[in-house]
């Protein structure tokens, strides 16, 4: 029961996390204009991974996509890649984990298969969460670097022939969404890995010798029973018969009530 709960909770947490990663990736507010001590009061700039937006003081908002690949900073491209990889891995992980859920029965799928799938999805969620956290952190680092560079420009760039000031940008809402979502996906993945351990009972092999009182009904092979996790071939603990050790009169005989231990 605890295993089912852990697995189910891990799935739900990961689902929320991946939804958050998708939301963060699509959001426009990855970086927002720093309004502190900024003279430009008529416009408010903010940017996402895919487009740049401007909100005028009149309330009019306009966005324009980055219709180029070569003109974009390499770091932005790297962040895009990390977020997409995170989403893809997370989506595959969700798909795998749906089939791995203990509460869902699909045909005659054994616990061993479910354990393997749970572990696979758990690892996928962990990697997905790490990708999102890495992507957001790389972007945040880029903002911090640009912030201090533009602050330096603000005071040194005003004396030359061309007075250039780079608007300072600070963390947007998408960064916080991404960090939280990545963390949730990571936690969900860890929970799935923990649940996997509970789904796969330890395999114990032991020899079982059967004794029977009735004459020559069935010849048994020692070690006829095997307790299995399902990773082996004898998954149903069926009796293993030695079909070749029969006498002439065994062909006619019927099993007695003592034949099965």
């Amino acid at each position: 029961m605890a295993v089912t709960a852990c697995q189910g909770l891990g799935f739900v947490v990961s689902l929320i996390g991946i939804a958050g990663i998708i939301a963060a990736t699509c959001m426009d507010q990855w970086s927002t204009q720093d309004l502190y001590n900024n003279p430009v009061t008529a416009v408010f700039n903010y940017q996402g991974l895919w487009r740049s937006c401007v909100r005028e003081s009149s309330g009019f908002t306009e966005c324009r996509g980055y219709f180029t690949l070569l003109g974009l900073p390499a770091m932005l491209q790297a962040v895009r890649a990390l977020m997409i990889v995170g989403i893809v891995l997370g989506a595959i992980g969700l798909l795998v984990s749906i089939f791995a859920l203990k509460c869902i029965r699909i045909g005659s799928m054994e616990d061993s298969a479910k354990a393997n799938m749970t572990l696979t999805s758990g690892i996928m969620f962990i990697v997905s969460g790490l990708c999102a956290i890495a992507g957001v952190s790389v972007f945040a680092n880029m903002l911090v670097t640009n912030f201090w560079m533009s602050t330096a420009n603000m005071y040194t760039g005003m004396g030359g022939m061309v007075q250039t000031v780079q608007t300072r940008y600070t963390f947007g809402a998408a960064l916080f969404v991404g960090w939280v979502a990545g963390g949730l996906t990571l936690i969900g993945g860890v929970m799935m890995c923990i649940a996997c351990r509970g789904l796969a009972p330890e395999e114990t092999n032991y020899k079982a010798v059967s004794y029977h009182a009735s004459g020559h009904s069935v010849a048994y092979k020692p070690g006829g029973f095997k307790a299995s996790t399902g990773f082996g071939s004898n998954t149903k603990n069926k009796k293993i018969y030695d079909g070749g050790a029969r006498t002439e009169d065994e062909v006619q005989s019927y099993p007695s009530k003592h034949d099965y231990v």
Epitope: S52, V54, Y66, T167, R168
Partner: nanobody, 122 residues
């Protein structure tokens, strides 16, 4: 790079008018939002007026509303500020600035002119 050069400043009597121009070179300012700022002696830089890259969305500081008019001519790559009913407190160095509207995945740049002095005195 965008180079901005202001002109049209000078001495004017209270109640008088002036028209400031800001000529851009180096790059067309058709994709840049443009602003006028001013800095009075011993004071900080103050926003005066804004106009977006299309020539719409004009916004003014409360102190100049109904007296100043911002406009631009993208074909001439020039920004204007028509100042009417000038007062003594309008005395300042006036700067024009071009603000990059849609930067490509990095913080936008602001380009500033050297400024032109406007003195309102009787």
């Amino acid at each position: 790079q965008v180079q901005l050069v202001e002109s049209g400043g000078g001495v004017v009597q209270p109640g008088g008018s002036l028209r400031l121009s800001c000529a851009a070179s180096g790059r067309a300012i058709g994709t840049y939002d443009t602003n006028w700022y001013r800095q009075a002696p011993g004071k900080g830089r103050e926003f005066v007026a804004f106009i977006n890259y299309r020539g719409g969305g004009a916004t003014y500081a409360d102190s100049v509303k109904d007296r100043f008019t911002i406009s631009r001519d993208n074909s001439k790559n020039t920004l204007y500020l028509q100042m009417n009913s000038l007062r003594a407190e309008d005395t300042a160095v006036y700067y024009c600035a071009a603000h990059e509207r849609f930067p490509m995945g990095r913080p936008p740049y602001d380009y500033w002119g050297q400024g032109t002095l406007v003195t309102v005195s009787s």
